[in-house]
């Protein structure tokens, strides 16, 4: 089958600081040297791009400075971290992987990770 399979966890719970991490793993049909990873958020029928990064195999994954994502890569595995999440950001986060170079191009789309974000309760005022 000329296709690329992408695996990611079904569910992740963000930390109380609004940080969620998950692994996106892809089974590469070819020997790619340039890979693009995109995180998409699907809410209802709306899809938005959360962040994206292109990296050379063996090099670090670099997102734009103002991105809410950071990540590291190791072989066919990408460790993604999304920060600054709030309860309203709860949703399905889909990992999209593209083998950009050399040809042929391959597209791989994961089934998505449902990220649950719970806003922390405000600390009650303390009387000292």
């Amino acid at each position: 089958c000329k296709a690329m399979h992408v695996a990611q966890p079904a569910v992740v719970l963000a930390s109380s600081r609004g940080i969620a991490s998950f692994v996106c793993e892809y089974a590469s049909p070819g020997k790619a040297t340039e890979v693009r990873v995109t995180v998409l958020r699907q809410a209802d029928s709306q899809v938005t791009e959360v962040c994206a990064a292109t990296y050379m195999m063996g090099n670090e994954l670099t997102f734009l400075d103002d991105s809410i994502c950071t990540g590291t890569s190791s072989g066919n595995q990408v460790n993604l971290t999304i920060q600054g999440l709030r309860a309203m950001d709860t949703g399905l986060y889909i990992c999209k992987v593209e083998l950009m170079y050399p040809p042929p191009y391959y597209l791989g789309i994961g089934n998505g990770t449902q990220i649950y974000v719970i806003d922390p309760e405000p600390c009650p005022d303390s009387d000292f």
Epitope: V47, E49, K96, Y106
Partner: antibody, heavy 118, light 108 residues
């Protein structure tokens, strides 16, 4: 709204050149792969070329490789197709299309007709 | 390259009838990367279905897609007058991107 508008088509002699443009609006141009697809009169759809996000990676159909060049100007949100050494069999309507988030071609322009004839 | 073969070439049906269009791939295609398009005379193609079975924005639910491996199907449950057109399948999981030759759905 999200829109693609092609221009630059016309009648040209075999061996000559033509440059097509596709002006994009209503979306972040740099976030999508952009394709050219053509359709010869009375025939089906044929994928021609694609350029990716930063414009560095490009792929071509074997039928146009070495003759056509795809490019994009992100500052102008415009896609181009430079067609050299045109042949009679290149006669077609040329469409630009956006590769959507999930890969399918979700937005299409109205098309521009290219006729190669002596 | 992955060759897509559509059948039948032409489908003659009446409004209200069910249309079943077939798309067969020369090698296995992941169901995530199979799309269907509709094209009316003088118009650009329009995305109907992506990922084999997901309807694109604004597409009515009388259109549905199914299949896996090498065999895929587009079904129009009850043909409306505006559904008479040419339909193309496409694979977009690997380069080169390829289309089927099309199936024309015409009024009987």
């Amino acid at each position: 709204q999200v829109q693609l508008v092609e221009s630059g088509g016309g009648v040209v002699q075999p061996g000559r050149s033509l440059r097509l443009s596709c002006a994009a609006s209503g979306f972040t141009f740099s976030s999508f792969g952009m394709h050219w697809v053509r359709q010869a009169p009375g025939k089906g759809l044929e994928w021609v070329a694609v350029t990716w996000y930063n414009g560095r990676n490009k792929y071509y159909a074997d039928s146009v490789k070495g003759r056509f060049t795809i490019s994009r100007d992100i500052s102008k949100s415009t896609l181009y197709l430079q067609m050299n050494s045109l042949r009679v069999e290149d006669t077609a309507i040329y469409y630009c299309a956006r590769g959507g988030y999930y890969g399918a071609f979700d937005i299409w322009g109205q098309g521009t007709m290219v006729t190669v004839s002596s | 390259e992955i060759v897509l073969t559509q059948s039948p070439g032409t489908l003659s049906l009446s409004p209200g009838e069910r249309a079943t269009l077939s798309c067969r791939a020369s090698q296995s295609v992941s169901s995530s990367y199979l799309a269907w398009y509709q094209q009316k005379p003088g118009q650009a193609p329009r995305l109907l279905i992506y990922g084999t079975s997901s309807r694109a924005t604004g597409i009515p639910d009388r259109f549905s897609g199914s299949g896996s491996g090498t065999d895929f199907t587009l079904t129009i449950s009850r043909l409306e007058p505006e559904d008479f057109a040419v339909y193309y399948c496409q694979q977009y999981g690997t380069s080169p991107w390829t289309f089927g030759q099309g199936t024309k759905v015409e009024i009987k």
